[in-house]
Amino acid sequence: QGWQAFRNDATEVIPGLGEYPEPPPENNQTMNRAENGGRPPHHPYDAKDVSEYSCRELHYTRFLTDGPCRSAKPVTELVCSGQCGPARLLPNAIGRVKWWRPNGPDFRCIPDRYRAQRVQLLCPGGAAPRSRKVRLVASCKCKRLTRFHNQSELKDFGPETARPQKGRKPRPGARGAKANQAELENAY
């Protein structure tokens, strides 16, 4: 508890739960300072005008902080970049522009899998190190935001929709839409 925001060494504020920033504007060179693409396109979708949707995964590296405390070691995780789109139309970095089906459903690239890691926090003033458990984003996926649910419900994209995921805690749909931060769990 108390991890409202993470701050890395470039003073980039990674919002706490409940705060979802808009992705940075499209740039031909970088997005979130991660470059050279992500994983190859995935999640085929059977649609009349779109053969495949792609979800860009960018990685980044940072130290986690909690107030004056800082992780003893840095971590690496993925950033799920913004809007999904047909793979054949995607630029190097996904912007907010919709190039197809303006009246169609809204697709978002959001965290899919997380990996739990334990990190040690070092605090100034001789305070004892603290151990925390974090959930780092391990993969991203496209989810469809339906207009039939007041734009609030994210649905799994592709064949996974009808398959319940065993052994995983349910994640509120609204939480994942733009969140790309490590999620902390109480680990005392």
Partner: nanobody
Amino acid sequence: EVQLVESGGGLVQAGGSLRLTCAASGRTFSSFVIGWFRQAPGKQREVVASITSGGSTYYEDSGKGRFTISRDNAKNRVYLQMNSLRPEDTAVYYCAAAEPAGVYDVWGQGTQVTVSS
């Protein structure tokens, strides 16, 4: 278990270039994310750049446009090409390895880079 050894550090004049090498031993090297970090005297260790097994790169603002990270999985090596060096780049440079979506748990011993004005 992956082990890392840095090399290529040294003394260089401002505006000069250096190429650091991180050599790894271990069969699973290619699956790790490799990062370069640095620590100047009296300061905290900070991120410089990192690269995934697939070649996706990340740069902190301090080295953006001047530093280039690359890797050769066949040789188990990761490189940091540093151009237009400045005195404030003086530090011990470390490479470290992390599993994807993980903590950088494996560290090299570091190589000293000194940039004189």
